[in-house]
Interface confidence: low
């Protein structure tokens, strides 16, 4: 198989080195020459020629392949020209010859992928590998080949990417800290509890890849899908030269699904305790897990220990399945929070779902705000509300919704960021229900919407009322 990697080498006598401390040369003969017909001789400048012991392999398709593995490491020297020639002993003729530098004929053995697992974000894949010859790993570059594992489509899309060793890991900016300036105050950012943009292809060229030594992280994959992956390496072309080695044996990995699919929502009320909730699946049990990471750059240990998220008592102990599962844990404000939900179906199959990582200050849920109103003229309401949290008044945005009596559809209004009230024009002599909710969406704090306030019933007057 590796021989085919040298196909672009036009020399009849092909040579390669796995570790630059070894050398293998071979050539193919179509003719059925008797055993012992050929000798492979070699010599460094100003040295006597020596014979390299040959073995032959019958190649039914080609004839015979003659192979020489240099017997002694001492005979393999870098940066000196090595003369090689094949002599026909019986005909006393040179069959073929070449001059090479061992340092330019590298064909590294494939790395061994030792671990492949989901990364810290949905659609991320993290792999680590071992280099068969660690002493040359600094002089190699790596390429990763991967694609979706689809039994129905063995020729699914494949991505081949060079691993960028100069990058340590993806910049760990604050997860999802989208600038609040370029959006309406209450626009939904892509938060761990909301639908982000859907990935359309499991192997888009946009997927990012970074590496640190013997590990790398791929992103932009399809959460919940299975992937196969392979690695190969080649000399960097600066210190050492050669060709791409063969691909490692394929490794397959099942990526966790995106917890968005379960409607995962995590929040804190006190910046200490985090509560997570997700939709309970029919005929399935589920369990939440969490871990904290302080990673700014590549952590030494990329394989975290997940801790149990303490399950909350079911709110309805009746027979029907509760709508949500909830769990809670103590958190820290100096770490990124990672959430995993495992759903076990009746046959015992476990499906994992990964939440998008977040900081605790990105998941602050406000208490439900109180709404006060007075009618200043017919159908003209003045609204007021108390900030649920005075400490973050300037980062709090609100949504007001109202509906006419007997109507199903709600009209939603978004007052300006930090507003403490507003006015509302309604039809005179009509009945309405009004509700208010709040959430943090500033540079310091963000979080999910509070629950809607209890409906406030308003009956507008016929004429001006003070």
């Amino acid at each position: 198989q590796d021989v085919s990697l040298l196909a672009s080498d036009s020399e009849p006598l092909k040579c390669f080195s796995r570790t630059f401390e070894d050398l293998t040369c071979f050539w193919d003969e179509e003719e059925a020459a008797p055993s012992g017909t050929y000798q492979l001789l070699y010599a460094y400048p100003r040295e006597k020629p020596r014979a390299c012991p040959l073995s032959s392999q019958s190649m039914p398709h080609f004839g015979t392949r003659y192979v020489c593995q240099f017997p002694d490491q001492e005979e393999v020297r870098l940066f000196f020209p090595l003369h090689l020639w094949v002599k026909n002993v019986f005909l006393n003729q040179t069959r073929t010859q070449r001059v090479l530098f061992v340092d330019s004929v590298g064909l590294p053995a494939p790395p061994s992928i030792i671990k492949a697992m989901g990364g810290s974000q949905p659609g991320e894949l993290q792999i680590s590998w071992e280099e068969p010859a660690p002493e040359i790993s600094d002089f190699l570059r790596y390429e990763l080949r991967y694609g979706p594992r689809d039994p129905k489509n063995s020729t699914g899309p494949t991505v081949i990417q060079l691993i960028a060793t100069e990058t340590c890991c993806p910049a760990l900016q604050r997860p999802h800290s989208a600038s609040a300036l370029d959006q309406s105050p209450c626009a939904q950012p892509t938060m761990p509890w909301q639908d982000g943009p859907k990935q359309t292809s499991p192997s888009r060229e946009a997927s990012a890849l970074t590496a640190e030594g013997g590990s790398c992280l791929i992103s932009g994959l399809q959460p919940g899908n299975s992937y196969w992956l392979q690695l190969r390496s080649e000399p960097d072309g600066i210190s050492l030269g050669g060709s791409w080695g063969s691909w490692s044996l394929p490794v397959t990995v099942d990526l966790p699904g995106d917890a968005v699919a379960l409607g995962l929502q995590c929040f804190t009320l006190d910046l200490k305790n985090v509560t997570c909730q997700w939709q309970q699946q029919d005929h399935a049990s589920s369990q939440g897990f969490f871990y904290h990471s302080r990673a700014r750059c590549c952590p030494r240990d990329r394989y975290p220990i997940w801790e149990n998220c303490e399950e909350e008592e079911k709110t309805n102990p009746g027979l029907q399945t509760p709508q949500f599962s909830r769990c809670h844990f103590k958190s820290r404000n100096d770490s990124i929070i990672h959430i995993l939900v495992e759903v076990t179906t009746a046959p015992g199959t476990v499906h994992s779902y990964l939440g998008s990582p977040f900081w605790i200050h990105q998941a602050v849920r406000l208490p439900t705000p109180n709404l006060h109103w007075r009618e200043i003229s017919s159908g003209h309401l003045e609204l007021e509300w108390q900030h649920p949290s005075s400490w973050a008044a300037q980062e709090t945005c609100y949504q007001l919704r109202y509906t006419g009596e007997g109507h199903q559809d709600w009209k939603v209004l978004e007052p300006p960021l930090g507003a403490r009230g507003g006015t509302l024009e309604l039809r005179p002599r009509s009945r309405y229900r009004l509700q208010l909710r709040a959430r943090l969406n500033g540079p310091t704090y963000q979080g999910p919407w509070s629950s809607w306030s209890d409906p406030t019933r308003v009956e507008t007057a016929t004429e001006t009322a003070w």
Partner: antibody
Framework: QVQLQESGPGLVKPSQTLSLTCTVS?????????WNWIRQPPGNGLEWIGY???????SYNPSLKSRVLISVDTSKNQVSLKLSSVTAADTAVYYC???????????WGQGTTVTVSS | DIQMTQSPSSLSASVGDRVTITCMAS??????LAWYQQKPGKAPKLLIY???SLETGVPSRFSGSGSGTDFTLTISSLQPEDFATYYC?????????FGQGTKVEIK
């Protein structure tokens, strides 16, 4: 035109050694190519037994390796098969075939039936 | 060993029919696949090599397709002399292995 002809005893007793020869005409077996033995139990599919190359290198099916020997008699231009310790499961039609340039069996003998029975 | 699985194991067809036989390898064999035809009491005859290449002298109604693990032999218009058993064989990895055969019978 290359022709292959298998020959050997049609009946072999259990535990004995089955010996077959394949006589090749129209081509020297030491010039080139690889010479194969394949068998087909009654009503069953084909099973590759092994080959010998023009240069005498052999390769055998691991399932039979401990019992099989393929050799050539260059003077008679024959390839021989020896299968030791036979049982009724070795009852089959035995074919020799040439593995040609394309790695496929391009020339076959007509086959010889061997029954293992006491 | 690489397992070769043919389907169907038998089929009934009429003269002029288009017949398709599939062969699946238990691992990737690239295009190292041959198809043989065998008639009762006769030795197999090579039809297709390298998955898609027609052996010299074989009628053009026979064609092969596929690569990797899934392969197909197609007879575009079945002739009376085509009623036989067909075998696929991989020659990617020793030991060479055959499919269990597909018997094409007259309907």
């Amino acid at each position: 035109q290359v022709q292959l002809q298998e020959s050997g005893p049609g009946l072999v007793k259990p535990s004995q050694t089955l010996s077959l020869t394949c006589t090749v005409s129209g081509y020297s077996i030491t010039s080139d190519y690889t010479w194969n033995w394949i068998r087909q139990p009654p009503g069953n599919g084909l099973e590759w037994i092994g080959y010998i190359t023009y240069s005498g290198s052999t390769s055998y099916n691991p399932s039979l390796k401990s019992r099989v020997l393929i050799s050539v008699d260059t003077s008679k231009n024959q390839v021989s098969l020896k299968l030791s310790s036979v049982t009724a499961a070795d009852t089959a039609v035995y074919y020799c075939a040439r593995l040609g340039r394309r790695y496929t069996m391009d020339y076959w003998g007509q086959g010889t039936t061997v029954t293992v029975s006491s | 060993d690489i397992q070769m699985t043919q389907s169907p194991s038998s089929l009934s067809a009429s003269v002029g029919d288009r017949v398709t036989i599939t062969c699946m390898a238990s691992e990737d064999i690239y295009i190292r696949l041959a198809w043989y035809q065998q008639k009762p009491g006769k030795a197999p005859k090579l039809l297709i090599y390298a998955a898609t290449s027609l052996e010299t002298g074989v009628p053009s109604r026979f064609s092969g397709s596929g690569s990797g693990t899934d392969f197909t032999l197609t007879i575009s218009s079945l002739q009376p002399e085509d009623f036989a058993t067909y075998y696929c064989q991989q020659y990617w990895s020793s030991p060479w292995t055959f499919g269990q055969g597909t018997k094409v019978e007259i309907k």
